[in-house]
């Protein structure tokens, strides 16, 4: 004849408040003849959670039909879980005895615990635009998770980020916590694009973590470089000069062009163009007239990006005796 | 929805035996004890005993063990309770309880010579 | 046998007061094995609270349970006419199971 062994498998198992708890008891015999019950708790003061033949336990059902002749499984689910309901849960084998049933054989308990899932995480960059080789910060935090255990993961394009620093707070006991990272991540030229993720893993998620991201682009500036050049061709008595301003971020651009040193003022033609990796190139090109008493002619082109100082390039237009004869209306 | 249902009201001689049913439904009555309680005129309530339908063992209250039966038909989901060697203090309402939660509505038994 | 008194034996209350009744065990029960029964006259008694401080469906939050050992109460916070009827508290800790005999809830 099998010994009885009470079987619970789950040490500990983690609830959420408002979900339904299941609490695992097999039995590997089934003698002696006798009920299974459901205690939380040890000693004289446990609390009953479950009798199958009398009592009110609205709130318990099974996972089996114990009336079933051979059932060996005593699992049971509890809904509507609250604070309230944490401890450890024992199913307990009865002899049948007179006047009453006897305790007979124990299951080593099942601790239910409170876990509470983290919030999803938020993550902040900086509150000021930086140029590339430039280390930003960016804070990621996430709250109201128990217990108290949680990998935290920083990445930038999949790649994983270790220069960071993570507190959970509070230290002691708490019915839930919250954690805190701040990354610091050095800023690529190419990082319009780019994003950083902050990844969170807790008990509670059942192995899906969650993510928090911010987008580079809101931490990046990259600042224009500018190209002033000549056209060949010329048209009539005009000079086509352009302006090429290249991988600049944000869009936020104004240029001006002046003609020695004065602000010009009529419209210019110019286009913009985004290049792959989220920058843009702006081109503008500026007709200058040309004349015979015109040979000193020095333009700007002066590029004031998203608020910072102006940048220019000057040049200095060339114009050939041949480029004159050219333009001019006598015949020789 | 969980029903007790029980039998009719009783007049007894004193010395003879009276025995109520309590038919149930909503449940299958082998998965629940059976209780049997008595409320004598404008007095409390007293348990009698119970029985555990899915094999037939009872538990009585010394008061009335000896003179109690609690048996229990699976076959038709009834319990049974029947008292015998009635006297005159066993006029009482009887009712019959499915595990201490659900109530049938009471039997009056009245023992007069 | 354990022994239930539940005192007073009757209450007299006016609607709107609050309600204190007291069940004394004469040996410890459990919490878990402690309910208490609301009945009507002509009717069968209604399980009202279960394991000491557990409402049963449909019963109103101005009641409450609480106790342990051997004492335990049954309060209603502010008395509605419906309330009033007679109490019993029931332990089902150990053979034979007993009743106490009953708080009479009254108008005043």
């Known amino acids: 004849e099998e010994e009885l062994q009470m079987i619970q498998p789950e040490k500990l198992l983690l609830v959420t408040v408002g979900k339904t708890a299941t609490l695992h008891c097999t039995v590997t015999s089934l003698l002696p003849v006798g009920p299974v019950l459901w205690f939380r708790g040890v000693g004289p003061g446990r609390e009953l959670i479950y009798n199958q033949k009398e009592g009110h336990f609205p709130r318990v059902t099974t996972v089996s039909d114990l009336t079933k002749r051979n059932n060996m499984d005593f699992s049971i689910r509890i809904s509507s879980i609250t604070p309230a309901d944490v401890g450890t849960y024992y199913c307990v084998k009865f002899r049948k005895g007179s006047p009453e049933n006897v305790e007979f054989k124990s299951g080593p308990g099942t601790e239910m615990a409170l876990g509470a899932k983290p919030s999803a995480p938020v993550v902040l960059g900086p509150a000021a635009r930086t140029t590339p080789e430039h280390t930003v910060s960016f804070t990621c935090e996430s709250h109201g998770f128990s217990p108290r255990d949680i990998t935290l993961k920083w990445f930038k394009n999949g790649n994983e980020l270790s220069d960071f620093q993570t507190n959970v707070d509070p230290t002691g006991q708490s019915v839930a916590y919250s954690i805190r990272s701040t990354a610091r991540v050095v800023l690529d030229p190419w990082d319009v694009r780019s994003q950083v993720i902050c990844e969170v893993a807790h008990v509670t998620l059942q192995g899906d973590p969650l993510r928090g991201t911010a987008n580079l682009s809101e931490a990046i500036r990259v600042p224009p470089t500018l190209e002033v050049t000549q056209q060949p061709m010329r048209v009539g008595n005009q000079v086509n000069v352009t302006c090429q301003v290249r991988k600049f971020y944000p869009q936020s651009l104004q240029l001006t062009w002046s003609e020695n040193g004065n602000v010009c003022q009529r419209e210019t033609a110019s286009t913009l163009t985004e290049n792959k990796d989220g920058t843009y190139n702006w081109t503008s090109w500026f007709l200058v007239n040309i004349s015979d008493q015109r040979d000193d002619v020095v333009l700007t082109c002066q590029v004031k990006h998203d608020g910072q100082l102006a940048v220019s390039k000057r040049l200095a237009l060339e114009v050939t005796v041949h480029q004159k004869d050219q333009s001019s209306d006598a015949t020789p | 929805e969980v029903q007790l249902v029980q039998s009719g009201a009783e007049v007894k001689k004193p010395g003879a035996t009276v025995k109520i049913s309590c038919k149930v439904s909503g449940f299958n009555i082998k998965d629940y004890y059976m209780h049997w309680v008595q409320q004598a005129p404008g007095k409390g309530l007293e348990w009698i005993g119970r029985i555990d339908p899915e094999d037939a063992e009872t538990k009585y209250a010394p008061k009335f063990q000896g003179r109690v039966t609690i048996t229990a038909d699976t076959s038709t989901d009834t319990a049974y309770m029947e008292l015998s060697s009635l006297r005159s203090e066993d006029t009482a309402v009887y009712y019959c309880d499915r595990g201490l939660a659900y109530w049938g509505q009471g039997t009056l038994v009245t023992v007069s010579s | 046998e354990i022994v239930l008194t539940q005192s007073p034996a009757t209450l007299s209350l006016s609607p709107g007061e609050r309600a204190t009744l007291s069940c004394s065990a004469s040996?410890?029960?459990?919490?878990?094995?402690l309910y208490w029964y609301q009945q009507k006259p002509g009717q069968a008694p209604k399980l009202w609270i279960y394991s000491t401080s557990n409402l049963a469906s449909g019963i109103p939050a101005r009641f409450s349970g609480s106790g342990s050992g051997t004492d335990y109460t049954l309060t209603i916070s502010s008395l509605e006419p419906e309330d009033f009827a007679v109490y019993y508290c029931?332990?089902?800790?150990?053979?034979?199971?007993?009743f106490g005999q009953g708080t009479k809830l009254e108008i005043k």
């Open positions: 040996s410890s029960v459990s919490s878990s094995y």
């Open positions: 029931h332990q089902w800790s150990s053979y034979p199971y007993t």
